[in-house]
């Protein structure tokens, strides 16, 4: 690794305020310059004195100054340094900071435990209509409905795994070819990448920390989206994939390994089967086109079961119908024959909380929506203020500076490989994409981690998500084990195929391009985020599924003219940037069009108009419900009472300046101050060091 | 212990009828299948008919339909068998039998047999 | 329907010989075939059902054996009081039919 610059003092004069704004660093450090640093040279630091925090005076910069919205906060240390505390303070310090700790684990815990009982209540709300989706005749010489069912099942059952191993009993089983099953596997990559966009929207009371988080999210969906906007129609032409991965199935006598390591799940589990424990078999039923599964609910009632293999006389018509031959009797009355059938027989009951409710699944499913996405909520929200009181100072030079810092000359362009290797290994480790991913997502918006970092590790969560599945391959039985092992296969090929589209030069890195933008355009309206989650992951695949149900014709019919409307408006945007002469006056820019084809702005007026209801409540609503109200009516005044989105950001609606909330800024002790959150003595009192 | 009592012999004249019973006792009437066999002197058996008592569903062989009809009363757990328009070589021995409802067992239980004579 | 045939239509054994009684099906019946003891003067007594399933309380020394057409019932060692005469019956379609029945005398 680099080395770490020897760090000037962190504040030379306690009296005056030191500025590193969040979300708007006037001066970007030089990355080349920063990286060839040795031990000995002294990092410069720029210090801006400034008043304190409650002068509006201090609110608006000088439209002047061009700020990087991207460019890490620098969250500075108020508290008394280690060496001026006494031995009581040094031992009370010590014990804040483990107390610190073990409540970090602790809601890290639970956010893990959530995004479990998350990914169960989507499957309870949505699971059996996911399973009747995958039975649809179409997907077999439709790659484009099988992808667009990837995502719309996998976003249904919040669980990419779920989704594909319904795809592998369904190839085992010769209900769907590898061919038919690759489209799908992709799709289930898009759908994976919704978890992490909704645990972004809850850091939405923060301008700057919404912009960096819901760009880190998206930074994965865009690869995602991307790769098969490319790979899709190469995969169509040439079954390269398929190819590919059927040789190395070919070629390796593979016998059945062991299970692949429930690593997380053995401490979540214990957890999360006291509130809700599913029977994912019926989901695959549905899909397998077994009419009794319909019936079923998805809540498992019993959890120790005996089965027994019986033989059962049943009547049938006449003796020619007998199963066989010699098992086959008359009473004189009725025509008998022998069944063989698996007689099950309840031993004893799960332990959850829904165990003897007997609720629709519909409603389980509701209640457990509400309750984890309070839960996700509330542990994102203390995680993001403890991880704010820690990472100060030295501790949050020190962090960033090992993550973001690339290796020295000419050896930085591996930190990102390497950092594609560590995703790997987080994601095996915890045995989810989804889960890694969306413990990336706060340290993205708090400012730990940079997007061009989170980059590479999101694409290392994809790889590992696909290892996990190839270990769960190995491990299944004889009959599912070439298919389940070639899909597996095809995941990860297909994830090797987008790196090396969108990763290795830096001018193909699209993604990171694509999500800043989106994180633009989402921090100033902040509905659009919930648009772009509905749009993305729900409107276009069903608008996608509901034309290809129509036909080949009706699709092509709608789609050509809607993607060469798409193409056109790229190419005209690449050309009005790049070289605008080559245009018309009037193409030059995108004025021709009425308001509301090229801006927000109209849009934005209409989502007020419709979310004033919210405004008028919102004040008196809990800090996490008061997240969710903003986001829907980006609103600054009305949470102004609970102080979690308070915004003094009016100013900005006004004129393109950008503006600092208490918040954003540098000390969150001092925004927290000048809010009346804290005493101004506790500033004094804060400890950071561990 | 499992019983099949059946009524006493009959002399009956041709083109009358008989109404022979079958009292059960020591099971399940409704459990079983209760049959008719009759055996003519010095002859084989031959089934008449069965009825199940749970639900009175009956058959009958082809040469008795019309002329024999298979009842079972469950409150009292007895199982009737009327023939009618009886010729002289409806002289036999009819038995009651029963046999286990939905299992291969056959007739596993028979009824001491009422001698019905058809004589003018 | 279905004919079964007994065969011998009787026999005469002595004590502790081995007897065969075969029964023949005029069509298959797979093992839906029972055999029954008739002693004179009594009534009808199941031995064996499903080709080879002794009944309850039936000596070990009656035994059963055949699938599709061909059947038998063996005695392993007669003994005075297997003097009956003995019937198979076919259950594999409607109407159950009897075998003419073979009688078992001792010499």
């Known amino acids: 690794m680099a080395p770490w610059p020897e760090l000037g003092d962190a504040q030379p004069n306690p009296d005056k305020y030191l500025e590193g704004a969040a979300g708007q660093q006037p001066t970007a450090p030089d990355k080349s310059k920063e990286t060839n640093k040795t031990d000995n040279t002294e990092a410069p630091v720029t210090k801006i004195e400034l008043l304190p925090s409650y002068s509006t005076a201090t609110l608006i910069d000088e439209p002047t100054e061009v700020d990087d919205p991207w460019n890490l906060p620098t969250l500075q240390d108020s508290g008394i340094k280690w060496s001026e505390r006494d031995t009581k303070g040094k031992i009370l310090c010590f014990f804040q900071g483990i107390g610190r700790l073990i409540l970090l684990l602790g809601f890290l815990y639970f956010f893990v435990c959530s995004l479990d009982i998350l990914s169960s209540a989507f499957q309870l709300v949505g699971g059996k209509m996911a399973g009747q989706f995958f039975s649809n005749s179409s997907i077999m010489s439709n790659p484009l409905l099988g992808l667009v069912i990837g995502v719309l099942v996998t976003v249904l059952v919040q669980s990419s795994s779920t989704s594909t191993s319904i795809v592998v009993s369904m190839v085992s089983s010769s209900l769907l070819t590898v061919r038919a099953a690759i489209p799908i596997i992709m799709g289930a990559n898009i759908g994976t990448s919704i978890t992490n966009t909704i645990v972004a929207l809850m850091q939405v009371g923060d301008r700057s920390e919404f912009r960096r988080a819901f760009a880190g999210a998206t930074v994965h969906d865009f690869f995602n989206w991307l790769s098969v906007l490319v790979l899709l129609p190469v995969e169509v032409a040439t079954h390269y994939l398929e190819i590919i991965t059927q040789l190395i199935v070919e070629s390796f006598h593979f016998k059945n390994g062991e299970d692949a390591p429930d690593l997380l799940k053995v401490i979540t589990k214990p957890f999360t089967k006291l509130i809700v424990q599913l029977d994912k078999k019926v989901i695959s039923q549905i899909a397998m086109n077994d009419e009794k599964a319909k019936n079923k609910s998805l809540v498992k009632i019993w959890c120790k079961t005996f089965t027994n293999k019986t033989q059962i006389n049943v009547t049938v018509p006449s003796t020619a119908n007998c199963t066989s031959p010699s098992l086959c009797w008359t009473d004189g009355i009725q025509n008998w024959t022998m069944k063989n059938v698996t007689y099950k027989e309840n031993i004893a009951k799960c332990q959850h909380i829904f165990v003897n409710f007997h609720l629709p699944d519909l409603a389980v499913g509701t209640i457990l929506l509400i309750l984890s996405l309070l839960v996700l909520c509330g542990c994102l929200i203390m995680i993001v203020k403890i991880l704010g009181s820690v990472l100060k100072g030295q501790v949050a030079t020190v962090i960033k500076k090992t993550i973001n810092t690339d290796f020295p000359f000419p050896f930085a362009w591996l930190t990102g490989y390497l950092a594609i290797l560590v995703g790997a290994g987080m994601t095996f480790i915890v045995q989810s994409s989804s889960v890694f991913t969306s413990a990336l997502t706060p340290l993205i918006g708090i400012g730990v981690i940079t997007i061009e970092r989170a980059y590479p590790l999101t694409l290392g969560s994809n790889i590992g998500t696909t290892t996990t599945a190839i270990l769960a391959a190995l491990a299944s039985p004889g009959n599912a084990l070439r298919s389940s092992l070639q899909i597996a296969l095809c995941h990860f090929f297909f994830n090797i195929s987008g790196i090396l589209l969108w990763y290795p030069i830096p001018f193909t890195r699209l993604p990171i391009r694509m999500a800043k933008g989106l994180g633009n355009i989402s921090a100033k309206y902040r509905w659009f985020a919930v648009f772009y989650l509905i749009i993305f992951f729900f409107l276009i695949p069903l608008t996608v599924f509901g034309l290809s149900l129509a036909g080949w014709r009706v699709l092509v019919g709608v789609g050509v003219p809607v993607v060469f409307i798409i193409i056109l408006v790229l190419c005209l945007r690449l050309l009005q940037s790049r070289c605008p002469r080559v245009l018309p006056k009037k193409l030059q820019n995108w004025n021709f069009l009425p308001l509301w084809m090229r801006s927000l702005k109209p849009w934005d007026a209409v989502v007020s108009k419709f979310t004033g209801c919210f405004q008028m409540r919102c004040c008196c609503c809990c800090r996490v419900c008061c997240r969710a109200c903003c986001l829907l009516c980006d609103c600054p005044k009305c949470c102004r009472c609970s102080k979690c989105c308070e915004d003094l950001e009016e100013a900005q609606e006004g004129q393109d300046v950008p503006v600092k909330a208490p918040e954003t800024f540098d000390n969150i002790t001092i925004s927290r101050e000048a809010q009346g959150e804290v005493p101004a003595s506790d500033s004094k009192t804060e400890c950071t060091a561990l | 212990q499992v019983q099949l009592v059946q009524s006493g012999a009959e002399v009956k004249k041709p083109g009358s009828s008989v109404k022979v019973s079958c009292k059960t006792s020591g099971f399940f009437f409704t459990e079983y299948i209760i049959h008719w066999v009759r055996q003519a002197p010095g002859q084989g058996l031959e089934w008449i008919g069965g009825i199940i008592p749970n639900n009175d569903v009956t058959n009958y062989k082809q040469n008795f339909r019309g002329r024999v009809t298979l009842t079972a009363d469950k409150s009292t757990s007895t199982a009737y068998m009327e023939l009618s328009s009886l010729r002289s070589e409806d002289t036999a021995v009819y038995y009651c039998?029963?046999?286990?409802?939905?299992?291969?067992?056959?007739?596993?239980?028979w009824g001491q047999g009422t001698t019905v004579t058809v004589s003018s | 329907d279905i004919q079964m045939t007994q065969s011998p239509s009787s026999l005469s054994a002595s004590v502790g010989d081995r007897v065969t009684i075969t029964c023949t099906a005029s069509?298959?019946?797979?093992?839906?075939v029972a055999w029954y003891q008739q002693k004179p003067g009594k009534v009808p007594k199941l031995l064996i059902y499903?080709?080879?399933t002794r009944h309850t309380g039936v000596p070990s020394r009656f035994s059963g054996s055949g699938s599709g057409t061909d059947f038998t019932l063996t005695i392993s060692s007669l003994q005075p009081e297997d003097v009956a005469t003995y019937y198979c019956?076919?259950?594999?379609?409607?109407?159950?039919?009897f075998g003419g029945g073979t009688k078992v005398e001792i010499k």
């Open positions: 039998a029963r046999w286990r409802n939905a299992y291969y067992s056959a007739m596993d239980s």
């Open positions: 499903w080709a080879s």
């Open positions: 069509q298959d019946v797979g093992t839906a």
């Open positions: 019956q076919q259950y594999r379609t409607s109407p159950l039919t």
